[in-house]
């Protein structure tokens, strides 16, 4: 028997520095978690103690904090190299700055293989990107070899900006021939490493013949055996065992997100490469694990540029950006309109000639808008200003909801109107009319939504049974502010870009902004 230790991360999303327990900015260092310096300490400890160790990342290192905004992926290559990752799969967010934003900072600088079997380059890009990512890589580990085959969510064209010269194939269809190729090379221990979410991970384990282990990402799935060490609630045991169609027991793992945990899986193989046993658990990277001093020093060196960046002008406003709770929790506010417009703009993807865009709607809880921006400071808007408006370090995500769920969400928006509560929704691509004289749960009298399957966008009445795409804060997707119906009834949820980054990019693009209050939210006569 031969034993392999798989250490794995996924959806780190730019959390290079340690964070608070909820993965936002670290405030009290004695209670902070994660970060690459702490991760390195634990990885090194395991490498010294155990013989056959692989450190793998299942994608979405890109996007999530000011680190990515400023360094654009160079920080990912640098610190992943420093941690000596053995392989990485491409995630959807690796394409957020286009293909060039992946090639130059990461693919050309990474000293480890970057993998995806289901992304095929065509046209002029094919030769440019040749060799910079691979479908699979065979890694010598001790006296054995292990094949790692990569995969990426085929939804990436809807979630990011991969351009027109990359084709995202079905994961299972693309993986099988690559696994077969590895088998012909006499590689009998194969790990599928990828970024398509837990449901697809399980399908791969079930359907792809020859895959021994699946290491996944994208769905931020937390698996744990025993009593979980922090706030995350396990979606199942670690590893999650799937019985493949050919009768094998295939362990599937994922390690939550944001570098809070280091996945730790021990696999025992027999001489024919069959998995005899698998066990482990994610390791919580809390303050009991010291930060490695040399990596920490490097982090501090790279930090300097971030501090300078946050005070630089991104663009100008020529109007007052009303982000006050007195406005945003009671009525349409122009800060809400600005943020929603930025959210839609960030999701412009012309992937189908029938649609001007794949998504037209935005909802945003008024309580998530934490500050106004005064235009009387020469109109200047900085990252620092935006961090006061959006201080929680959230993301703007893409969900699919039925019209009936959206109707419930808008009823919830005003179910206790007048108490300055955070659930009052700001919108984009939606016209809503409330009648507050009616009883809670029956106050939405008109709800029109902007069409997507149209050449000239116009507002049509919401259809209860239709499925709509909506951009919203991850806070709402997770049922925050009482929006349990969104969490319970959403049909799909893909995590998006950092909230501040979305707004800052939009302001930089527009250069000068002047959002208005324009009748997106109305109250019917006599009730307000």
């Amino acid at each position: 028997a031969w034993e392999l230790t798989i250490l794995h991360t996924n959806d780190v999303h730019s959390r290079l520095e340690q964070t608070s327990e909820d993965s936002s900015k670290c405030v009290n260092a004695s209670r902070c978690m994660g970060g690459v310096a702490r991760l390195f300490t634990k990885v090194q400890q395991i490498r010294r103690a155990e013989p056959n160790v692989l450190l793998l990342d299942a994608g979405d290192q890109y996007q999530g904090t000011i680190w990515f905004t400023v360094y654009k992926g160079a920080e990912v290559a640098h610190f992943m190299n420093a941690l000596r990752y053995d392989a990485m799969a491409l995630g959807n967010h690796e394409f957020d700055n286009g293909v060039e934003g992946l090639i130059e900072p990461l693919l050309k600088e990474a000293k480890f293989p970057i993998l995806s079997a289901n992304i095929k380059a065509k046209g002029p890009l094919a030769s440019q990107i040749s060799g910079l990512y691979l479908p699979y890589k065979v890694l010598p580990v001790g006296d054995e070899v292990v094949g790692i085959v990569g995969y990426t969510s085929k939804e990436t064209p809807f979630l990011s900006n991969p351009g027109t010269n990359l084709v995202f194939e079905d994961e299972i269809t693309a993986l099988q021939p690559e696994v077969d190729k590895l088998k012909t090379l006499n590689v009998n221990k194969i790990i599928a490493l990828g970024h398509s979410g837990f449901e697809m991970d399980k399908l791969i384990a079930q359907k792809v013949r020859g895959v021994d282990v699946v290491v996944g990402g994208h769905s931020n799935t937390f698996l744990y055996t025993g009593n979980p060490p922090s706030k995350e609630v396990p979606a199942g045991k670690y590893p999650f065992i799937v019985t493949s169609d050919d009768g094998r027991k295939v362990p599937v793992v994922q390690a939550y997100a944001f570098g809070k945990y280091l996945g730790y899986l021990k696999i025992e193989f027999d001489e024919r490469g069959n998995v005899i046993s698998s066990h482990g658990n994610p390791i919580l990277l809390n303050s009991s694990i010291p930060e490695d001093p040399s990596i920490k020093a490097d982090i501090n060196k790279w930090r300097i540029k971030l501090d300078n960046y946050s005070t630089q002008e991104l663009g100008k406003t020529i109007v007052y950006l009303d982000g006050s709770s007195q406005s945003c929790r009671f009525r349409e506010c122009n800060m809400g309109n600005l943020i929603c417009d930025a959210m839609i703009n960030n999701n412009l993807r012309h992937t189908d000639e029938m649609f001007w865009n794949h998504v037209s709607m935005c909802i945003l809880n008024g309580g998530g808008i934490r500050s106004p921006i005064d235009e009387r400071n020469n109109g200047t808007i900085t990252w620092e200003n935006l961090a006061a408006v959006l201080p929680f370090g959230g993301t703007f995500d893409l969900v699919q909801l039925k019209g009936s769920t959206l109707k419930k969400a808008f009823e919830h928006s005003v179910h206790r109107y007048g108490q300055s509560t955070g659930e009052f929704l700001q919108v984009g691509g939606i016209h809503v009319v409330y009648d507050l004289s009616r009883k809670p749960g029956d106050r939405v009298v008109k709800l029109d939504v902007l069409c997507t399957k149209c050449r000239v966008p116009s507002y049509d009445p919401l259809k209860m049974d239709e499925v709509y795409k909506v951009i919203l804060p991850n806070f709402l997707a997770n049922g925050g502010d009482g929006f349990q119906m969104i969490k319970d009834e959403l049909l799909r949820h893909d995590s998006g870009d950092q909230d501040i980054n979305v707004v800052s990019t939009y302001i930089s693009k527009m250069k000068v902004i002047y959002p208005a209050v324009e009748g997106r939210i109305k109250f019917s006569t006599g009730s307000h």
Epitope: R84, F112, Q128, V138
Partner: antibody
Framework: EVQLVESGGGLVQPGRSLRLSCAAS????????MHWVRQAPGKGLEWVSG????????GYADSVKGRFTISRDNAKNSLYLQMNSLRAEDTALYYC???????????????WGQGTTVTVSR | QSVLTQPPSASGTPGQRVTISCSGS????????VNWYQQLPGTAPKLLIY???QRPSGVPDRFSGSKSGTSASLAISGLQSEDEADYYC???????????FGGGTKLTVL
């Protein structure tokens, strides 16, 4: 300036041993995997052995497996090749080579020393 | 006998474009990236191309690499007399678990 300087070559009888050393300077040694590559007189290049940044992963060409041992001392910025049971066909110029990565099986070889000559003869 | 196959020699006149081929199998070039090395007479080899088509800094853009299937090629345009050297391709081999080189191509500038 990045430099690799090999030493330890010489004339040795078949069946005997020799230890080659390579002193590295001008870069952070433990950031890189290292290799030994040889070139027989008038012939092409042949990879001999590779070692990852922390000695955690090591590989050998079939022609030297079981006879040669690669090692490194990161504290001394040094790479070594212990050659036992030497044969006439081991006669070659031995290059110390830096990998472009910290794993010897990825990225290729980006910096080469000038080589040290090993002659195996009676 | 080298694992990767290169023509033993190639030639061209100054200013011309020459191409050197390198043929392998599914376990080396077919699965991994290709590197090219230049060895000027009496000197150590030097990295010319890595990851199929990437040039290290300092290598003129007259040198370019490409890969297709289990073969790779090195193209040198605007040939100069100082390009006279031996050229070697190399790739990691997943079956042999080691680096393999081509036998080398001696380029003569006429």
């Amino acid at each position: 300036e990045v430099q690799l300087v090999e030493s330890g070559g010489g004339l040795v009888q078949p069946g005997r041993s020799l230890r080659l050393s390579c002193a590295a300077s001008g870069f952070t040694f433990d950031d890189y995997a290292m290799h030994w590559v040889r070139q027989a007189p008038g012939k092409g290049l042949e990879w001999v052995s590779g070692i990852s940044w922390n000695s955690g992963s090591i590989g050998y060409a079939d022609s030297v497996k079981g006879r040669f041992t690669i090692s490194r001392d990161n504290a001394k910025n040094s790479l070594y090749l212990q050659m036992n049971s030497l044969r006439a066909e081991d006669t070659a110029l031995y290059y110390c080579v830096r990998s472009g990565s910290y794993n010897y099986y990825y990225y290729g070889m980006d910096v080469w020393g000038q080589g040290t000559t090993v002659t195996v003869s009676r | 006998q080298s694992v990767l196959t290169q023509p033993p020699s190639a030639s061209g006149t100054p200013g011309q474009r020459v191409t050197i081929s390198c043929s392998g199998s599914s376990s080396n070039i077919g699965s991994n990236t290709v590197n090219w090395y230049q060895q000027l007479p009496g000197t150590a080899p030097k990295l010319l191309i890595y990851s199929n088509n990437q040039r290290p800094s300092g290598v003129p853009d007259r040198f370019s690499g490409s890969k297709s299937g289990t073969s790779a090629s090195l193209a040198i345009s605007g040939l100069q007399s100082e390009d006279e050297a031996d050229y070697y391709c190399a790739a990691w081999d997943d079956s042999l678990n080691g680096w393999v080189f081509g036998g080398g191509t001696k380029l003569t500038v006429l």
